[in-house]
């Protein structure tokens, strides 16, 4: 799996999970989230050569097409596969509210 | 939806469905498929600016992050959303076989 266990321990140019810390205020301009101040969102990036963690038959076809037709602009892309939620604390007036934001943290990647 | 109805009628630099005809022999080197000789596979391509058909909360966060930090390499990618199968005819010896290959045709796209 193209997850932290594999990707963070290997130098990998191909599609893999990459570390990314996002500070809500600095990076998104969000002032409404009180806690946490930021989080490890991670992201997916890297090349998708033939059979490198292809998600579907179409992505396998596309990567093979791209191998045979390297000048073509059609190729699979490295995107998130498994995502996890993030629990946040914010305030409405002086009332604290806890909410779980779904699909905020990328745990693994795929070529799609 | 970023499907043929929208994308093939509009000139769109952002993430959209793009037409792509794949000839099995020429483009993939596959000689085993007897019919069809090729098919409209389509593919997804284009920029993923903030809120452009974001798939998940993470892709929304990532596109906003990319807007505020344009020098960053972290950004969402335009990939397939809905896929359809393709029915093919091939031979095992002289025996014709009909099979449905799943997820072969892209019908719509998303930013993920």
């Amino acid at each position: 799996a193209l997850d932290a266990a594999y990707c963070f321990r290997n130098v990998q140019d191909n599609c893999c999970l990459r570390p990314l810390y996002i500070d809500f205020k600095r990076d998104l301009g969000w002032k409404w989230i009180h806690e946490p101040k930021g989080y490890n969102a991670n992201f997916c990036a890297g090349a998708c050569p033939y059979l490198w963690s292809s998600d579907t038959q179409h992505s396998r076809v596309l990567s093979l097409y791209n191998t045979i037709n390297p000048e073509a602009s059609a190729s699979p892309c490295c995107v998130s596969q498994d995502l996890e939620p993030l629990t946040i604390l914010y305030y409405i007036g002086k009332t604290p509210k806890i909410e779980q934001l779904s699909n905020m943290i990328v745990k693994s990647c795929k070529c799609s | 939806a970023l499907d043929a109805a929208y994308c093939f009628r509009n000139v769109q630099d952002n993430c959209c469905l793009r037409p792509l005809y794949i000839d099995f022999k020429r483009d993939l080197g596959w000689k085993w498929i007897h019919e069809p000789k090729g098919y409209n596979a389509n593919f997804c391509a284009g920029a993923c600016p903030y809120l452009w058909s974001s798939d998940t909360q993470h892709s929304r966060v990532l596109s906003l992050y990319n807007t505020i930090n344009p020098e960053a390499s972290a950004s969402p990618c335009c990939v397939s959303q809905d896929l359809e199968p393709l029915t093919i005819l091939y031979y095992i010896g002289k025996t014709p076989k009909i099979e449905q290959l799943s997820n072969m045709i892209v019908k719509s796209c998303k930013c993920s």
Partner: antibody, heavy 117, light 103 residues
Framework: EVQLVQSAAEVKKPGASVKVSCKTS????????MNWVQQAPGAGLDWMGQ????????NYNGKFKGRVTLTADTSTSTAYMELSSLRAEDTAVYYC??????????WGQGTLVTVSS | EIVMTQSPASLSLSQGEKVTITCRAS??????LAWYQQRPGQAPKLLIY???NLADGVPSRFSGSGSGTDFSLTISSLEPEDVAVYYC?????????FGQGTK
């Protein structure tokens, strides 16, 4: 390299005010919260408050009853902690510490403030 | 405010022994907890952040576990330089209170 360098030790009289500085380098000062922590002699750590230098936003510990004021000078990348109406029990080491990823990852060396008549 | 309760208050151990320090929050703080080491006359040093993540440059003999209200810091094999006071601190709504420390 991230560095937080604090001002020298101070001796103050009860009722006076003290202003401790924390000069930073090696990171974007305006983009990280700065926390302040008090440690009385032989005691544990007490969180006093935090400031976001980018916009001056602050959060304070009510324990210090409005006696603490946090400020930041973005032109010199320096954070300040002012404690007023000093009393003997304010004798302590005061630390500035950068907030990052659900922790305070870099700390100043500490500034001893002695309150004595 | 959230109260952080650390135990034990102090420990006396030998080199090579395993030690576990616990920290309990008065309410759910999810994984928003850090551990620090403070040697005599020095500023605290970050060991663990987000409950389980080892800070840069910290030896692998240190590890953190837990979420919700119960957390622990483990030193798998004590070294002489580990003599210090250890503190936990939550980051789930201000004030960010500390545990009382374990010597």
């Amino acid at each position: 390299e991230v560095q937080l360098v604090q001002s020298a030790a101070e001796v103050k009289k009860p009722g006076a005010s003290v202003k401790v500085s924390c000069k930073t380098s090696g990171y974007t000062f305006t983009s990280s919260w700065m926390n302040w922590v008090q440690q009385a002699p032989g005691a544990g750590l007490d969180w006093m408050g935090q400031i976001y230098p980018g916009d001056g936003d602050t959060n304070y510990n009510g324990k210090f009853k409005g006696r603490v004021t946090l400020t930041a000078d973005t032109s010199t990348s320096t954070a300040y902690m002012e404690l007023s109406s000093l009393r003997a029990e304010d004798t302590a080491v005061y630390y500035c510490a950068r907030h990052y990823d659900g922790s305070t990852d870099y700390w100043g060396q500490g500034t001893l403030v002695t309150v004595s008549s | 405010e959230i109260v952080m309760t650390q135990s034990p208050a102090s420990l006396s151990l030998s080199q090579g022994e395993k030690v576990t320090i616990t920290c309990r929050a008065s309410e759910n703080i999810y994984s928003n907890l850090a551990w620090y080491q403070q040697r005599p006359g020095q500023a605290p040093k970050l060991l663990i952040y987000a409950a389980t993540n080892l800070a840069d440059g910290v030896p692998s003999r240190f590890s953190g576990s837990g979420s919700g209200t119960d957390f622990s810091l483990t030193i798998s094999s004590l070294e002489p330089e580990d003599v210090a006071v250890y503190y936990c601190q939550h980051f789930w709504g201000t004030p960010y209170t500390f545990g009382q420390g374990t010597k």
